[in-house]
Structures are given as structure tokens and as C-alpha cells.
């Protein structure tokens, strides 16, 4: 219950919004963990950076990387080249000493690439408004900084 | 073109169960969630849940839970829905419905009329 | 669960009008909204989804807007084919919630 979805294709990027109340939760790092089992603890995958004020610095896991947009509320996790064993249930964590607050509940369901013949049943080809782009990728919801951009432009 | 083909009308006693199917050609079927829908006669739409074929598995709204049970059969492309213990409250419209990668469901079955009467 | 409010469930118009037909969800979903459209004895059909993203095929006067919790769906100029009922779906959150639909009619 009080679970967002998000769909992506195997061997593709899934890209996973998680908005939050940016002044309820500053000066919070974040993290997304793994749900293991219904009721069993939450697996740490990956953290944002340790100084908040780098949070929208890209940190990476394997194939799981995070940034937060501490301004605009939302923390996106990315997941490279989505495996079958990716799916499942997960969190978005908001973290303060040794607790941590699940921002958002999230189940990641894998499908199959269309254009991969292994198991595709008929051919799929993306209709007149959507690019393979548009169809494989869940953007996030609000604008979050990328990596290597500073939060403010210097001022002179 | 993608057509979701909903099997026919059935009339069934209560305590009964019952099991639909929904054949979905002309797209890759395990490369999108099947869902299906409750609409009772005059009345508003109601999520059941959804099989992601490629997977097996299943995401339930609680409220059907005991209710329905959602297969699929990749070889014919077909999705299923079993609904056991019926009663007259189970008398509906059942639609099986593709969700697409924007999310919202782009394609819908005609429909699966579900009468419970002894 | 989230609730979808659909403020009217039905609707006197005119056929060249401009239609605005409101959702209200409980809590914020962040735009991930869909409207349809559904006719006597037929299936719904997808409009809109992602609150403002027309669907292929989709006549240009439609239209969605909105944010947070509150969403319109717009007619431009009703046409005698856009006489049907129109509901709205959250996929925000499971389990995925519609509203209880609003239904146009002639005056």
C-alpha cells in the first residue's frame, strides 16, 4: 500500500523520483535501500555524499547512483542497465543520526525489451509520440541537478 | 495493431468461481503490465491489479486480494483472471487494460460480463 | 488509499461550449494523472496521461492541466463525439484510484 510504481525495460536506465518536503528534511542526507521480504529490515544500496551541501553530487553503487535536488525536494536514483533481479520493493530514506524516515515506498517491476527477440511474442515499435527514449525511461518529476553542477551560479 | 480479446459473457451461481481470459496480439506481451479493471453497471472504475508477464508477478489491490488471482501466459499472449467465492456484489464489467511506459492504460479489452445469480 | 473527487458526476452542456471538468485528489500525486473517456457499452479510452501529455490520436481540444492535488481536464469546443463519461486515475500510489467519473449531457 502507499507504493509508487515504476516500470522499466531490462538492459535499459530506469531513472526513480522520490519528492520530499525540502524544509522539513534540511540538512538530511538521503539514501535508498532494498526491501528484504515484506516485514525484513531495508539494505542500504547507496547514500547521498557525506557534506549535505553536496548532496547533488552523482554518487554511485554498481549500477545504482543517487543525487538529491535539496532546493526542489527530490531525491532521484538512477539503475543502469536494469536486470531482472533489480525488481522489487524499495525505499527512499531520509537519514538523521542513526534513524531513518522512509520518504517513499517504490516497486520497481522489470519488463521485457520489445525489440529483444529472446522473448518478445510480436515486434513492438514505439508509436508516432513516443521515442524509445520516452517509452524506456521514468523521468523525474521536478528538474534535479546534474553532476559536477554547483547548487547557485557564483556570484560576482 | 495491439487488440485485447476478452472472452465472453458469463453467468455463474454464487459460491462459484470463474476465469477470463484477455489475449493481447500484436505487441510484445511481456513488455508491459496487464491490468484489469471493475466496473459494476452505472457505476465508476475500479483498479483490481495488475500480472507483469515478464516476471509472473502481481501487484493487488487489497480490496481483491482474496478475491482475484492474475496469471499469464506468455506463449499465447494471454492474461487471465481467476474470481472465486462469488456473490452479486461480483456482477460487473470486468476490462483487462495494457499500461503503457507513460503509465495510464492505452489499450482496453471490450469487456467481460460477469452475471452472479442463482 | 487515495481519493479521486470528481466535483460534479454530471453535466448540462451545449455543443460548441467550453467544458472544464475538475479531479481532486486526496493528497498530492505529483502529476501522475490520467483522464478518459468512455462511451455506453465501450471500454474507457485514454486521453491524457501524466496530467498534460495528449495521447496520439487524441483530438487537439483536449487538454490537461494541473498539479499537487488538483487537475482539469478542458474541452475546447464540445463536439457531438465528446458526449460521454470522463474520469480521472491516480497511479501515484497503489492502489491505483479513479474518480467517479462526470458524465456530459445535452442541454
Known amino acids: 500500500h502507499n507504493t509508487t510504481v515504476f516500470q522499466g525495460v531490462e538492459g535499459q536506465s530506469l531513472q526513480v523520483s522520490c519528492p520530499y518536503d525540502s524544509m522539513k528534511h534540511w540538512g538530511r542526507r538521503k539514501a535508498w535501500c532494498r526491501q528484504l521480504g515484506e516485514k525484513g529490515p531495508c539494505q542500504r544500496v547507496v547514500s547521498t555524499h557525506n557534506l549535505w551541501l553536496l548532496s547533488f553530487l552523482r554518487r554511485r553503487n554498481g549500477s545504482t547512483a543517487i543525487t538529491d535536488d535539496t532546493l526542489g525536494g527530490t531525491l532521484t536514483i538512477t539503475l543502469r542497465n536494469l536486470q531482472p533481479h533489480d525488481a522489487g520493493f524499495y525505499q527512499c530514506q531520509s537519514l538523521h543520526g542513526s534513524e531513518a524516515d522512509t520518504l517513499r515506498k517504490v516497486l520497481v517491476e522489470v519488463l521485457a525489451d520489445p525489440l529483444d527477440h529472446r522473448d518478445a511474442g510480436d515486434l513492438w515499435v514505439p508509436g508516432e509520440s513516443e521515442s524509445f527514449e520516452d517509452a524506456h525511461v521514468e523521468h523525474s518529476i521536478s528538474r534535479s541537478l546534474l553532476e559536477g553542477e554547483i547548487p547557485f551560479p557564483p556570484t560576482s | 495493431e495491439v487488440q485485447l480479446q476478452q472472452s465472453g459473457p458469463e453467468l455463474v451461481k454464487p459460491g462459484a468461481s470463474v476465469k477470463m481470459s484477455c489475449k493481447a496480439p500484436?505487441?510484445?506481451?511481456?513488455?508491459?503490465?496487464m491490468n484489469w479493471v471493475k466496473q459494476k453497471p452505472g457505476q465508476g472504475l475500479e483498479w483490481i491489479g495488475y500480472?507483469?508477464?515478464?516476471?509472473?508477478?502481481?501487484n493487488y489491490n487489497e480490496k481483491f486480494k482474496d478475491k482475484a488471482t492474475l496469471t499469464s501466459d506468455k506463449s499465447s499472449s494471454t492474461a487471465y483472471m481467476e474470481l472465486r467465492s462469488l456473490t452479486s456484489e461480483d456482477s460487473a464489467v470486468y476490462f483487462c487494460a495494457r499500461s503503457s511506459y507513460r503509465y495510464g492504460f492505452d489499450y482496453w479489452g471490450q469487456g467481460t460480463t460477469l452475471t452472479v445469480s442463482s | 488509499d487515495i481519493q479521486m473527487t470528481q466535483s460534479s458526476s454530471s453535466f448540462s452542456v451545449s455543443l460548441g461550449d467550453r467544458v472544464t471538468i475538475t479531479c481532486k485528489a486526496s493528497e498530492d500525486i505529483y502529476n501522475r494523472l490520467a483522464w478518459y473517456q468512455q462511451k455506453p457499452g465501450n471500454a474507457p479510452r485514454l486521453l491524457i496521461s501524466?496530467?498534460?501529455s495528449l495521447e496520439t490520436g487524441v483530438p487537439s481540444r483536449f487538454s490537461g492541466s494541473g498539479s499537487g492535488k488538483d487537475y482539469t481536464l478542458s474541452i475546447t469546443s464540445l463536439q457531438t463525439e465528446d458526449v460521454a463519461t470522463y474520469s480521472c486515475q491516480q497511479y501515484w500510489s497503489t492502489p491505483w484510484t479513479f474518480g467517479g467519473g462526470t458524465k456530459l449531457e445535452i442541454k
Open positions: 500484436g505487441y510484445s506481451f511481456t513488455s508491459y503490465l
Open positions: 500480472i507483469n508477464p515478464y516476471s509472473a508477478g502481481s
Open positions: 501524466g496530467a498534460t
